[in-house]
Interface confidence: medium
């Protein structure tokens, strides 16, 4: 199962989620780790 792992010890406040690539800007879409605490793919 592919999971995000939150390694911060506090509540994560997200930016707006995007679920379709048409909503991803050509630059923003390539950024990895916008979450507080970072992102790890299991």
């Amino acid at each position: 199962d592919a999971e995000f792992r939150h390694d911060s010890g506090y509540e994560v406040h997200h930016q707006k989620l995007v679920f379709f690539a048409e909503d991803v800007g050509s630059n923003k879409g390539a950024i990895i780790g916008l979450m507080v605490g970072g992102v790890v793919i299991a």
Epitope: F4, L17, F19, K28, G29, I31, I32
Partner: antibody, heavy 124, light 112 residues
Framework: DVQLQESGPGLVKPSQSLSLTCTVT?????????WNWIRQFPGNKLEWMGY???????SYNPSLKSRISITRDTSKNQFFLQLNSVTTEDSATYYC?????????????????WGQGTLVTVSA | DIVMTQAAFSNPVTLGTSVSISCRSS???????????LYWYLQKPGQSPQLLIY???NLASGVPDRFSSSGSGTDFTLRISRVEAEDVGVYYC?????????FGAGTKLELK
């Protein structure tokens, strides 16, 4: 480990509403991700129906938009599908599934966890 | 909607040999960010679908490296080398370039 389980009536009459529940264990539906309904028709065709994300925002397949509603009960960690005015064409196995968001990592827009599915037959 | 096209069946495969499964999209799935939004799922008999490949060529966690995927913007191939009995099932391609997310009709892998 997150687990999803669908439940609801297996038989619905034409013109009535189909209502299903997905119970999520091992993860809070308000913490992250989007929580989807997908159905599989006889013959294996898969159709994405829509989702409700962790913040309560919904997105629906335009082909169903006039008939579908996805809601949630955060206190029970459940989300729900309501499909109105059903016909025999809505007979299918209905899955709930979790998908993560492209905003966090562009690699992650996939269905990572699925329920086992529940068969719904529409018949008089 | 983007239409995903797959053959209903693969040629029957002998254990230990290789097989390729094809998928075609009605529109290029290559985004301006350089990523191709094509996924492969396997649905084993009696089970829910499971992810094999994400964004055209990346192997999902826990998937054996016997599986690989390649393609252009519209034509894609899933290759299984050294087919095992547990690989039997229906293989679906899917896209999330545009809403609604759409799946192919599935290709059934059968053994000789």
């Amino acid at each position: 480990d997150v687990q999803l389980q669908e439940s609801g009536p297996g038989l619905v009459k034409p013109s009535q509403s189909l209502s299903l529940t997905c119970t999520v264990t091992g993860y809070s539906i308000t913490s992250d991700y989007a929580w989807n309904w997908i159905r599989q028709f006889p013959g294996n065709k898969l159709e994405w129906m829509g989702y409700i994300d962790y913040s309560g925002i919904t997105s629906y397949n335009p082909s169903l938009k006039s008939r579908i509603s996805i809601t949630r009960d955060t206190s029970k960690n459940q989300f729900f599908l309501q499909l109105n005015s059903v016909t025999t064409e809505d007979s299918a196995t209905y899955y709930c599934a979790r998908i993560s968001g492209l905003d966090y990592d562009v690699r992650a827009g996939w269905f990572a966890s699925w329920g086992q599915g529940t068969l719904v037959t529409v018949s008089a | 909607d983007i239409v995903m096209t797959q053959a209903a069946f693969s040629n029957p495969v002998t254990l230990g040999t290789s097989v390729s499964i094809s998928c075609r999209s009605s529109k290029s799935l290559l985004h301006s960010n350089g990523i191709t939004y094509l996924y492969w799922y396997l649905q084993k008999p009696g089970q829910s679908p499971q992810l094999l490949i994400y964004q055209m060529s990346n192997l999902a966690s826990g998937v054996p490296d016997r599986f690989s995927s390649s393609g252009s913007g519209t034509d894609f191939t899933l290759r299984i080398s050294r087919v095992e009995a547990e690989d039997v099932g229906v293989y679906y391609c899917a896209q999330n370039l545009e809403r609604p997310l759409t799946f192919g009709a599935g290709t059934k892998l059968e053994l000789k």
